[in-house]
């Protein structure tokens, strides 16, 4: 279930897990279904807050991903301590009206009090029924 991602910060992310997805194989996001994501990262700062930002490029058009709870402290225990590893588990209910696409790039960024905590880009996602 471990998937390959491109780091877009300073290699804070240790691993990303998505049930049913493997390595660099296409990862299917099903419309109207829950999409589970787990990420392990090492905090690069002490922070009281952790805010998640998810953007998707669908056929080259960048969009904010709807229906996201931005407070990462709802799904991991805050505050975060620099140097410690944390496990984020999040389930996103994919909208039924999400556009179908074979070319989806997802960028997940976690922001702390002093800037980027972690950042990953998944380049092999697809949105299907």
């Amino acid at each position: 279930d471990q998937v390959d991602v491109k780091d877009c910060a300073n290699h804070e992310i240790k691993k990303v897990l998505v049930p049913g997805c493997h390595g660099s194989e296409p990862c299917i996001i099903h419309r109207g279904k829950p999409f589970q994501l787990e990420a392990v990262f090492e905090a690069n700062q002490n922070t009281k807050t952790a805010k998640i930002e998810i953007k998707a490029s669908i056929d080259g058009l960048e969009v904010d991903v709807p229906g996201i709870d931005p407070n990462a402290c709802h799904y991991m225990k805050c505050p975060l301590v620099k140097g410690q590893q944390y496990d984020i588990k999040y389930t996103w209910n994919v909208p039924k009206i999400a556009p179908k696409s074979e070319n989806v790039v997802v960028t997940v960024k976690v922001m702390g009090d002093d800037g980027v905590l972690a950042c990953a880009i998944a380049t092999h996602a697809k949105i299907r029924d």
């Epitope: 904010d64 996201i68 931005p70 402290c73 709802h74 805050c78």
Partner: antibody
């Protein structure tokens, strides 16, 4: 002073609709994480809905498809549009602000009573 | 769905220590918050993130959490502490409250 004031409660027949308002002062409602929480007479607290500054909304299963949470930046007000009301929706409805440095509701309104009865 | 279990009532003698528990599966891995509610009034946050007190809350109020139990402790209980107390956690994007505990100060 930072505070929230609810209004819009009242007596409504089953199947009817009602819109609750929550006016904020001392902070901007629409740039904060905001929630509605209700309390049936003699019962405990029950979460109803949450809205985040980016516009994402979440609902308890008991109200999903019937209630809609929203905010108006110009009025600095949070709303709860309630439809297809049932007797079990009878409760005091509170709006509350979530402090993101605490993940807890640090500011609450005084509550507004909604009674669903024929 | 995630559930939190609290005792319906707890009694404490004036000036003694009251402990109110909140049980949940692996609750120690979550941030636990506590609210005090007096009759006819809105809830008031008394402890956030397991053990932190908001400004204005007396030092008599403290909290802890580990394993499957979180505990709100009120030392040297006063008559004014008589109220309902609720624990709260986030289960991903869902707010979960405990059923509430009525604290009686004898």
């Amino acid at each position: 002073e930072v505070q929230l004031v609810e209004s819009g409660g009242g007596l409504i027949q089953p199947g009817g609709s009602l819109r609750l308002s929550c006016a904020g002062s001392g902070f901007t409602v629409t740039t904060n994480y905001m929630a509605w929480v209700r309390q049936a007479p003699g019962k405990g607290l029950e979460w109803v809905s949450t809205i985040y500054s980016a516009g994402s909304t979440f609902y308890a299963d008991s109200v999903k498809g019937r209630f809609t949470i929203s905010g108006d930046n110009s009025k600095n007000t949070l709303y709860l549009q309630m439809g297809s009301l049932r007797a079990e929706d009878t409760a005091v409805y509170y709006c509350a602000r979530e402090n993101p440095a605490q993940d807890a509701f640090d500011i609450w309104g005084q509550g507004t009573m909604v009674t669903v009865s024929s | 769905s995630y559930e939190l279990t609290q005792p319906l009532s707890v009694s404490v003698a004036l000036g003694q220590t009251a402990r109110i528990t909140c049980g949940g599966n692996n609750i120690g891995s979550k941030n636990v918050h506590w609210y005090q509610q007096k009759p006819g009034l809105a809830p008031v946050l008394v402890i956030y993130r397991d053990s932190n007190r908001p400004s204005g809350i007396p030092a008599r109020f403290s909290g802890s959490s580990s394993g499957n139990t979180a505990t709100l402790t009120i030392s040297s209980a006063q008559a004014g502490d008589e109220a309902d107390y609720y624990c709260h956690v986030w289960d991903t994007s869902t707010v979960v409250f405990g059923g509430g505990t009525k604290l009686t100060v004898l």
